[in-house]
């Protein structure tokens, strides 16, 4: 049993890091493998992650972490029984994938304006809370070409757009994702999408 693709990990910079790797053949990850991880820090304890299958030869493990900060560095040991298959390290702050925003809501009761709001996925005491920027994707269910991205570079988790910038009388969907420049993160996953019917009064033509 050998590792074909070494583990690569990403952290949500809060409580979970996800590591994925591939074996050289079909593997029952949860029964055959264990990923041991330990913070390189005084008094830290070793933890064991039981991996799940991710395709025939792929494995994935969700590592639970406390109080993630930029100085943290973890040792990783991948074991098959008594055999050490791979040894590595992981610095969560260097491989951040933020959590997806939640609670995306479209408020259509403001005159001729659409207000989209969502929730910041981090608590106020997390460093990323004040450093996320967002991308909002709006698309038409009827017209695949009607697809747009709005970049929200301010801190407030909201976006206002004129209803007239979208077609009237048809349904639209929106979703939002986040990233943080400070840690050069990847984009988060998209939030679940929300749907609304866009209708506004056309201006009266003389």
């Amino acid at each position: 049993m050998k590792v074909l693709q070494e583990p690569t990990c990403v952290s949500d910079y809060m409580s979970i890091s996800t590591c994925e790797w591939k074996m050289n053949g079909p593997t029952n990850c949860s029964t055959e493998l264990r990923l041991l991880y330990q913070l390189v820090f005084l008094l830290s304890e070793a933890h064991t992650c039981i991996p799940e299958n991710n395709g025939g030869a792929g494995c994935v493990c969700h590592l639970l972490m406390d109080d993630v900060v930029s100085a943290d560095n973890y040792t990783l040991d991948l074991w098959a029984g008594q055999q050490l298959l791979w040894k590595g390290s992981f610095k969560p702050s260097e491989h951040v994938k933020p959590r997806a925003p939640g609670n995306l809501t479209v408020h259509t009761n403001v005159s001729d304006t659409l207000l989209l709001t969502w929730s910041n996925p981090y608590p106020p005491d997390n460093y990323l809370y004040n450093h996320l920027t967002y991308a909002v994707n709006i698309w038409s269910e009827n017209d695949p070409a009607d697809f747009r991205i709005y970049n929200v570079t301010y801190l407030e988790p909201s976006l206002r757009i004129a209803a007239s910038t979208l077609k009237s009388g048809i349904s639209y969907r929106a979703r939002v994702r986040a990233w943080a420049q400070c840690y050069n993160t990847t984009w988060s996953e998209w939030s679940p999408s929300t749907k609304w019917h866009n209708s506004y009064r056309e201006p009266f033509e003389q």
Epitope: F41, L42, L43, S44, E45, D66, D67, V69, S70, A71, D125
Partner: antibody, heavy 116, light 111 residues
């Protein structure tokens, strides 16, 4: 919000021991290390040691080895610092402080006076 | 005995800028991150800067931190009378056993 509530002021005689408590609330108690830091009157901050509330393991500054004991009670989310063989130079305000590499939150401090 | 050295005192007028230095060694500041604490008279220390240059939520951007080699600097702009306090730098040292040294402390007076 995070709160670290420390026990009240103590007056002790030289050679005695003192036990200071620090009750934590507003966060997951076992997820954050706790430091103890003291400050003698008009002096700077001095690190005494650290405890991992999850397993209870500890590490102490070399200066206090053999005289200090840090413990925790997870059922009450409380950490304790006991200092023995007290001398007049131990007169100080003793702080508990939550954090790992740095101290995010501090208790208000407990004044321990050692006097004959 | 502090292994991090700070000036005993600094002073400046309201609205001015002041910097406080913190000098250490390769086994502490040179190999770790620096934090800064503000201690107002009669109160417990409060985290001002961590990770060399990051501010906890609620700390105004008048406060900044930087690190170069084995030294660190705290900067305060737009000085206010409420900034009058003692300031301590802190880090950790893994040279022999893990320890958390603090700086000697700097008294800031707002004139």
């Amino acid at each position: 919000q995070v709160q670290l509530v420390q026990s009240g002021a103590e007056v002790k005689k030289p050679g005695a021991s003192v036990k200071v408590s620090c009750k934590a609330s507003g966060y997951a108690f076992t997820s954050y290390y706790m430091h103890w830091v003291r400050q003698a009157p008009g002096q700077g901050l001095e690190w005494m040691g650290i405890i991992n509330p999850r397993g209870g393991s500890t590490s102490y500054a070399q200066k206090f080895q053999g005289r200090v004991t840090m413990t925790r009670d997870t059922s009450t989310s409380t950490v304790y610092m006991e200092l023995s063989s007290l001398r007049s130079e131990d007169t100080a305000v003793y702080y508990c402080a939550r954090g790992k590499y740095w101290m995010y939150d501090w208790g208000k401090g407990t004044l321990v006076t050692v006097s004959s | 005995q502090s292994v991090l050295t700070q000036p005993p005192s600094v002073s400046a007028a309201p609205g001015q800028k002041v910097t406080i230095s913190c000098s250490g060694g390769s086994s502490n500041i040179g190999n770790s991150y620096v934090s800064w604490y503000q201690q107002l008279p009669g109160t417990a220390p409060k985290l001002l800067i961590y990770d060399n240059n990051k501010r906890p939520s609620g700390i105004p951007d008048r406060f900044s931190g930087s690190k170069s080699g084995t030294s660190a600097t705290l900067g305060i702009t737009g000085l206010q009378t409420g900034d009058e306090a003692d300031y301590f730098c802190g880090t950790w040292d893994t040279s022999t056993v893990w320890e958390w040294p603090f700086g000697t402390g700097t008294k800031l007076t707002v004139l």
